[in-house]
Amino acid sequence: APPPINKLALFPDKSAWCEAKNITQIVGHSGCEAKSIQNRACLGQCFSYSVPNTFPQSTESLVHCDSCMPAQSMWEIVTLECPGHEEVPRVDKLVEKIVHCSCQACGKEPSHEGL
Amino acid sequence: APPPINKLALFPDKSAWCEAKNITQIVGHSGCEAKSIQNRACLGQCFSYSVPNTFPQSTESLVHCDSCMPAQSMWEIVTLECPGHEEVPRVDKLVEKIVHCSCQACGKEPSHEGL
């Protein structure tokens, strides 16, 4: 995929932006007490463009799409208490913790911390 | 797919934008004379966001991506002359003529009007 576009010559005053916003995430499970955790969500306006196709195609289709998504994240365990469930007094949920975000090719998905 | 987002409560000063820009498009084919035609390209900054996943998943994955793409286009025939090609003296190329553009769900295929 081509690298993300941050500036366009046609619109010199416009810039792509993609931020990791602090959020309070509610982690829940049926029959358990939900927990609020601090996390981050990615939010932004990346560039996209579409140049008309021809058929038969002369060149590669000139369509570009960037999307604001996690550039780095990791999974953490969040334990929920489940009162009244003697057999399952607690449930462990896995939560993706987003570290930071960037404009990336729309087909590409977010990355997770190294092995 | 959810409707495109034009405004975000978190960023009241930001607006999605997606324009149809006039361009001169070169339509070519190997061994034929290229033609210049007037066309339009879509260009813009639509909103996208990504909210962290959980496992087991509690809700649908909260990922949204809009992309600037043709909202209306049609295909036109452009005939190219191919001198020195007695067997194929001309070639008909189909060219997508973009009418207007809008922010639409990234996975969506652009809509085309018939010939």
């Epitope: 999974w75 399952v88 998905e109 990355s111 997770h112 | 996943n53 994955s61």
Partner: antibody, heavy 118, light 112 residues
Framework: QVQLVQSGAEVKKPGASVKVSCKAS????????MHWVRQAPGQGLEWMGI????????SYAQKFQGRVTMTRDTSTSTVYMELSSLRSEDTAVYYC???????????WGQGTLVTVSS | DVVMTQSPLSLPVTPGEPASISCRSS???????????LDWYLQKPGQSPQLLIY???NRASGVPDRFSGSGSGTDFSLKIRRVEAEDVGVYYC?????????FGQGTKLEIK
């Protein structure tokens, strides 16, 4: 829905290499690591290694070190496992399985039978 | 490498009766964060394995509540409250504390 679709069965000669693919769909490809696990006929499960599809970093079981290579193509959401210098003991069904981070293997491919025979 | 040992290797059960499988690890799977890095999988005949239990005691999505996982450190067990015909297959424990991840030899559950 989440799907891991693996390439078809292969028959190889001893000493050759095999490359098995695993195409992911229905989820955010790089939000989940991918494991490779194999199972010889009538035997148990054997863990081969893991790849992080985002950066491409890998960790292999010592037993396969130097013979196995795991790669990924984010543009097609596909992970590959290549095993070289094949011997008859490598005859097995090879599975890819995704995992949230380094946690459990929650979805598995349908498996690819690799037969090594002269 | 962490060695995982399951018992019994074969388990004939009458439908409606309980069943229990044991899994022992050669070193503790209890991490400093308080979680046991032990999962259970079921491989039904002719199918790919499926996740039953993760982190020692958590049922995966869609797993019937007759399945439960327990234990800590080096001793773990999988219990089926009332065995049903659809539960036949080979059960595996697997540790994800450290690489290489390792599986138990498998326990074959069959209906009497």
């Amino acid at each position: 829905q989440v799907q891991l679709v693996q390439s078809g069965a292969e028959v190889k000669k001893p000493g050759a290499s095999v490359k098995v693919s695993c195409k992911a769909s229905g989820y955010t490809f790089t939000s989940y690591y991918m494991h490779w696990v194999r199972q010889a006929p009538g035997q148990g499960l054997e863990w081969m290694g893991i790849i992080n599809p985002s950066g491409g970093s890998t960790s292999y079981a010592q037993k396969f070190q130097g013979r196995v290579t795991m790669t990924r193509d984010t543009s097609t959401s596909t992970v590959y496992m290549e095993l070289s210098s094949l011997r008859s003991e490598d005859t097995a069904v090879y599975y890819c399985a995704r995992a949230p981070g380094k946690f459990p293997l929650d979805y598995w491919g349908q498996g690819t039978l690799v037969t090594v025979s002269s | 490498d962490v060695v995982m040992t399951q018992s019994p290797l074969s388990l004939p059960v009458t439908p409606g009766e309980p069943a229990s499988i044991s899994c022992r690890s050669s070193q503790s799977l209890l991490k400093s964060n308080g979680y046991n890095y032990l999962d259970w999988y079921l491989q039904k005949p002719g199918q790919s394995p499926q996740l039953l239990i993760y982190l020692g005691s958590n049922r995966a999505s869609g797993v019937p509540d007759r399945f439960s996982g327990s234990g800590s450190g080096t001793d773990f067990s999988l219990k089926i409250r009332r065995v049903e015909a659809e539960d036949v297959g080979v059960y595996y424990c697997m540790q994800t504390l450290q690489t290489p991840y390792t599986f138990g030899q498998g326990t074959k559950l069959e209906i009497k």
